[in-house]
């Protein structure tokens, strides 16, 4: 033979301002006879919610039908949540008394507490690009949440980063929290087309997290090799020198060549190709006039990337001497 | 229509124990409180306890705690009184009685009544 | 617990008498809590009136209950042969529901 019981499932109900919060309430028996009020808080001062018998309760609605026999669901709906709403919310059956009714049981209870959602992680980058095998810090904010509980995870590429510091502020009571996450993310030369995830989970989201990228294209630098080499055939007097930058990234790139220390002035042809992880082949051609005047060419390919201390790479010009009498043959 | 039907007279000896019956008909018997209700000869009515037989709950006079357990059957739409350590004060009629409705207390069906007597 | 008194215990009346007999509460009884039954002699009880002053199914319109608070009344506005029998008070306002003494109606 069982007692009846008092049953209201949720210990925390979370809502938002201006909605609609239900507060569930079923008992598990009719006896003994009487009815079931809603309170707010205990003890002498408590708010009476909902008294179905009697009192004004223009917010209050029942989600059962009272009037309906062996009813045993006394949930109900208030309207038009406000901050003064929050507290802790108890069904209370009681017993049909003389003079009064007498207090039977009460439910657990349910705390009705505001939620607000977080807002959308916004995260930012270092300010200034690095390069591979070195660490960048990326910052991971949102704001305005409640409760104050929240998870906050990072990825890169789709694998959890452990190398993070996360705080919570304020520390104590507030109507609204905010969250500061910094990862710390070393980068990989393949990282260009490599994302960085901060996912923030809270109850108010119903197991959708937020989530925030950055781009470590953004963070990254990826230096360029050089290699310059003389292409085996010439044409007519003309030697034909080959620049090649090979996987640089950001595109951003000033190539000049020099002959004997003397900058070139005139066009060169290029080409600029993408690699599959998004760093950049830049090749350059140098066509060099060769005279018999001319015994010792040097070619120097100088490349300044992305702003950074120009890097150049050097070639001793290889003319043999049949080159020459053929170019002597060429002179007017 | 609704009817109460109980069970016939008992003539126990004290000290024993005796279980008396009350079958429903003509309505859901599991939606409707049942209580029952003590009559000593030449006396009034003093109510015992009741129960819920949709949950098989019960509510007892505090007078009769101990004395009465009340009990109900939903296959067979019966609900028991059992009475124990029997004297003579237990001699009575007793009647099983149905509310109109959960929210109007008063005894709209009765039984018939069945008269215990308790004799050595 | 309530304590229902009812007076008188007895009355004899004639045939066509008006009859009035009363149920006093030891605690104030809402007037939708407040029942009238009658019982004769070998027979279980029948209602008579419910809720103060509403007449249960196929009770005559002679009846009548009246009151409030904690003090309630039954009225046979003429008395017929038939009406002999001893009628309770009941409450259903707080646990323990009980019942008054009675009043044996006992016609002349």
């Known amino acids: 033979e069982e007692e009846l019981q008092m049953i209201q499932p949720e210990k925390l109900l979370l809502v938002t301002v201006g909605k609609t919060a239900t507060l569930h309430c079923t008992v598990t028996s009719l006896l003994p006879v009487g009815p079931v009020l809603w309170f707010r808080g205990v003890g002498p001062g408590r708010e009476l919610i909902y008294n179905q018998k009697e009192g004004h309760f223009p917010r209050v609605t029942t989600v059962s039908d009272l009037t309906k026999r062996n009813n045993m669901d006394f949930s109900i709906r208030i309207s038009s949540i406000t901050p003064a709403d929050v507290g802790t919310y108890y069904c209370v059956k009681f017993r049909k008394g003389s003079p009064e009714n007498v207090e039977f049981k009460s439910g657990p209870g349910t705390e009705m507490a505001l939620g607000a959602k977080p807002s959308a992680p916004v995260v930012l980058g270092p300010a200034a690009r690095t390069t591979p095998e070195h660490t960048v810090s990326f910052t991971c904010e949102s704001h305005g949440f409640s409760p104050r509980d929240i998870t906050l995870k990072w990825f890169k590429n789709g694998n959890e980063l452990s190398d993070f510091q996360t705080n919570v502020d304020p520390t104590g009571q507030s109507v609204a929290y905010s969250i500061r996450s910094t990862a710390r993310v070393v980068l990989d030369p393949w990282d260009v087309r490599s994302q960085v995830i901060c996912e923030v989970a809270h109850v108010t989201l119903q197991g959708d997290p937020l989530r925030g990228t950055a781009n470590l294209s953004e963070a990254i630098r990826v230096p360029p090799t050089l290699e310059v080499t003389q292409q085996p055939m010439r044409v007519g007097n003309q030697v034909n020198v080959t620049c090649q930058v090979r996987k640089f990234y950001p595109q951003s790139l000033q190539l000049t060549w020099s002959e004997n220390g003397n900058v070139c002035q005139r066009e060169t042809a290029s080409t600029l190709t993408e690699n599959k992880d998004g760093t950049y082949n830049w090749t350059s051609w140098f066509l060099v006039n060769i005279s018999d005047q001319r015994d010792d060419v040097v070619l120097t390919c100088q490349v300044k990337h992305d702003g950074q201390l120009a890097v150049s790479k050097r070639l001793a010009l290889e003319v043999t001497v049949h080159q020459k009498d053929q170019s002597s043959d060429a002179t007017p | 229509q609704v009817q109460l039907q109980q069970s016939g007279p008992e003539l126990v000896k004290p000290g024993a124990s005796v279980k008396m019956s009350c079958k429903a008909s003509?309505?859901?018997?599991?939606?409707?409180?049942l209580s029952w209700v003590k009559q000593r000869t030449g006396q009034g009515l003093e109510w015992i306890g009741e129960?819920?037989?949709?949950?098989?709950?019960?509510y007892y006079n505090e007078k009769f705690k101990g004395k009465a357990t009340l009990t109900a059957d939903k296959s067979s739409n019966t609900a028991y009184i059992q009475l124990t350590s029997l004297t003579s004060e237990d001699s009575a009629v007793y009647f099983c009685?149905?509310?109109?409705?959960?929210?109007?207390?008063?005894?709209?069906?009765w039984g018939q009544g069945t008269l215990l007597t308790v004799s050595a | 617990e309530n304590v229902l008194t009812q007076s008188p215990e007895k009355m004899a009346v004639s045939l066509g008498q008006k009859v009035t007999m009363t149920c006093s509460a030891s605690s104030s009884v809402s007037s939708s809590d407040l029942h009238w039954y009658q019982q004769k002699s070998g027979a279980s009880p029948k209602p008579l009136i419910h809720?103060?002053?509403n007449l249960a199914s196929g009770v005559p319109a002679r009846f009548s209950g009246s009151g409030s608070g904690t003090s309630y009344s039954l009225t046979i506005s003429s008395v017929e042969a038939e009406d002999a029998a001893t009628y309770y008070c009941?409450?259903?306002?707080?646990?323990?529901?009980?019942f008054g003494g009675g009043t044996n109606l006992e016609i002349k």
């Open positions: 003509g309505y859901t018997f599991s939606e409707y409180v």
């Open positions: 009685g149905r509310f109109y409705d959960y929210d109007g207390g008063w005894f709209a069906y």
């Open positions: 129960i819920y037989p949709g949950t098989i709950t019960t």
């Open positions: 809720g103060t002053s």
């Open positions: 009941q409450q259903w306002s707080g646990y323990p529901w009980t």
